[in-house]
C-alpha cells in the first residue's frame, strides 16, 4: 500500500478506468446478444 499523494490519485483513476472498461464490456456483450437474438 502506498501513502504517496501522486499514487493515491492515480490508483483512483485506474479503478475508474477498470470500472468503465468492465461496464463497456458488459454493455457491449448485452448489445451483441440483442442483435444476435433479432
Amino acid at each position: 500500500h502506498s501513502d504517496g499523494i501522486f499514487t493515491d490519485s492515480y490508483s483512483r483513476y485506474r479503478k475508474q478506468m477498470a470500472v468503465k472498461k468492465y461496464l463497456a464490456a458488459v454493455l457491449g456483450k448485452r448489445y451483441k446478444q440483442r442483435v444476435k437474438n433479432k
Epitope: 500500500h1 502506498s2 501513502d3 504517496g4 499523494i5 501522486f6 499514487t7 493515491d8 490519485s9 492515480y10 483513476y13 485506474r14
Partner: antibody, heavy 115, light 110 residues
Framework: QSVEESGGRLVTPGTPLTLTCTVS????????MIWVRQAPGKGLEWIGI?????DTYYASWAKGRFTISKTSTTVYLKIASPTTEDTATYFC????????????WGQGTLVTVSS | DVVMTQTPASVSEPVGGTVTIKCQAS??????LLWYQQKPGQPPKLLIY???TLASGVSSRFKGSGSGTEFTLTISDLECADAATYYC????????????FGGGTEVVVK
Amino acid sequence: QSVEESGGRLVTPGTPLTLTCTVSGFSLSSYAMIWVRQAPGKGLEWIGIIYDNGDTYYASWAKGRFTISKTSTTVYLKIASPTTEDTATYFCAREPGSTTQNDLWGQGTLVTVSS
Amino acid sequence: DVVMTQTPASVSEPVGGTVTIKCQASENIYNSLLWYQQKPGQPPKLLIYRASTLASGVSSRFKGSGSGTEFTLTISDLECADAATYYCQNYYNIWTNGAAFGGGTEVVVK
C-alpha cells in the same frame, strides 16, 4: 531511506546516456518516482514519472526524448539523443507521502553535453 | 500540459518582514499544488502539499493558500535562513496534465 542518482558525465551530442537512481529503505512497488532536471542557473523542469505499477508519463516536451524504467530497487532515465540543451543536473525523487508528510530527493547527477 | 506561472521572479525583504509569492495555473488544478524551497547546490525541499498542508518539520511561518488556478505562498517573520528560491508544482491528474513547476521566485533577505 535514501535516493541516489549516478551516471552523469560529459557526453558528445547524440550519444545515448542512461542515468541511474538507486533507492533504499522503501519499496518502488509502493511509490511513484519522478525525474526532474535543472540547467545551470535555471529553474526546475519536470521530465516524467513512473508509478508503482510501472506506468510512465512524460512532460510534452520530453516525450520521445526520454525513457523512464525501473527494477525492484532502481529507476532509470534514458536520454535517447542528448543535445547541448540537455546539459543539467538531473534529480530523482520519491513522491510526497500524505502520512509521512515528506518526499525524498537525491543530490542530483550532472550531465554535460558538449562536442 | 498545465502551465504554472509564478510571480515575482525575485523579491527582497528585510529580516522580520513578509514575502508573498503567487502561482497561477493555466487551468483548474483544485488543491493539487506543492511548494518547494531550494538553496544553491541542494535539491528542493518540500514545504507544503495539497496547497495548504505543511510538510513534516516545516516552520509554521510558511503558509500556503488558494485553490483552482490561484495559489499563494506567504513567508512571515523572515529569517536569513529563508533566503532561497521557491517553486510551485502542479500534480493534478499528472497522467494527462503533467507536473510542471513554476519558474521560481528568488527570495533575498536583507
